[in-house]
């Protein structure tokens, strides 16, 4: 069966939107009005992995681009990157672990924990216009809570 996907945008809990910054980087910044059209649309695919009521494994691709968020070790540090894939083979139900995030819903907010690196989360800085990153903290200065906005296909 084909993998189930939906199109969406994400905003962090400070209402910053995610935009492309160069070919392989996302940044978080406040957008208004027509600038909202700059925000990236994700194709969120529901993939194979450990699942529970509030934890759902997903992959986050960029809509109509052969790019997926993935988690890899760089300089001994778990790092978030945008990775090119062969569009003929992706998305798929059994995604490699580096592409998988546990979507965790808490109080109507979403966290995205790396399946490859437990306790590391898609994060944004309090500061404006900084790259989105894989962070190792929760509940401090950096932001790990997001809201999801559905986008029609």
């Amino acid at each position: 069966a084909p993998v189930r996907s939906l199109n969406c945008t994400l905003r962090d809990s400070q209402q910053k939107s995610l935009v492309m910054s160069g070919p392989y980087e996302l940044k978080a910044l406040h957008l208004q009005g027509q600038d909202m059209e700059q925000q990236v649309v994700f194709s969120m695919s529901f993939v194979q992995g450990e699942e529970s009521n509030d934890k759902i494994p997903v992959a986050l691709g960029l809509k109509e681009k052969n790019l997926y968020l993935s988690c890899v070790l760089k300089d001994d540090k778990p790092t978030l990157q945008l990775e090119s894939v062969d569009p003929k083979n992706y998305p798929k139900k059994k995604m490699e672990k580096r592409f998988v995030f546990n979507k965790i819903e808490i109080n109507n907010k979403l966290e995205f924990e790396s399946a490859q690196f437990p306790n590391w989360y898609i994060s944004t800085s309090q500061a404006e216009n900084m790259p989105v990153f894989l962070g190792g903290t929760k509940g401090g200065q950096d932001i790990t809570d997001f809201t999801m906005q559905f986008v029609s296909s």
């Epitope: 778990p78 800085s125 216009n129 900084m130 790259p131 190792g136 903290t137 200065q141």
Partner: antibody
Framework: EVQLVQSGAEVKKPGASVKVSCKAS????????MHWVRQAPGQGLEWVGL????????VNNQKFKGRVTMTRDTSTSTAYMELSSLRSEDTAVYYC???????????WGQGTLVTVSS | EIVMTQSPATLSVSPGERATLSCRAS??????IHWYQQKPGQAPRLLIK???DSDYGIPARFSGSGSGTEFTLTISSLQSEDIAVYYC??????????FGQGTKLEIK
Amino acid sequence: EVQLVQSGAEVKKPGASVKVSCKASGFSFTGYYMHWVRQAPGQGLEWVGLIIPHNDYTVNNQKFKGRVTMTRDTSTSTAYMELSSLRSEDTAVYYCARSDYYGAMDYWGQGTLVTVSS
Amino acid sequence: EIVMTQSPATLSVSPGERATLSCRASQNIGTSIHWYQQKPGQAPRLLIKYASDSDYGIPARFSGSGSGTEFTLTISSLQSEDIAVYYCQQGASWPPFTFGQGTKLEIK
């Protein structure tokens, strides 16, 4: 009130080890990156390494080649830095500091003077 | 690793005058630079984060600017209590976090 309180001054012989503590209060210990930065007498600031209390990840300056061990106790909100095989060049004030991911160190401990002398 | 180079090593400025401290990164760090003030016998104190954001409680005479590789810390009207060593530090690419060698600010 955010506070980082470090252990007291130490005098060690070359080849020995030293363990410095940093007790955090007034904030969520697991919500920040905890750094160790040192300053030799009359010199500048040098990053030693960091620990992430939330997931126990550590990374240090390659300069220290495995001589540095950083640990934490989340039950007491305390970070520790142990430096082994001490040499005279390790004489310095060692600071702990908290930061966000991009390293803005907004609170610092008072510093711990480690003196290495035979 | 990213090397941070500060200039000048020592700066002498008259009270009430403007002090301009520079920091250069060996590669593009965007705005991921932070400035610290350190007085003798004290721990460093964060002044400016992310190139231009003042930390809480920092007097308005301190400001930061720049992006990419060239950055500036400005003290608009020097006070005697501003005499200290100032350090820049990058957080764009770690490990390691790296500091500049410092600029010593003196009263002329």
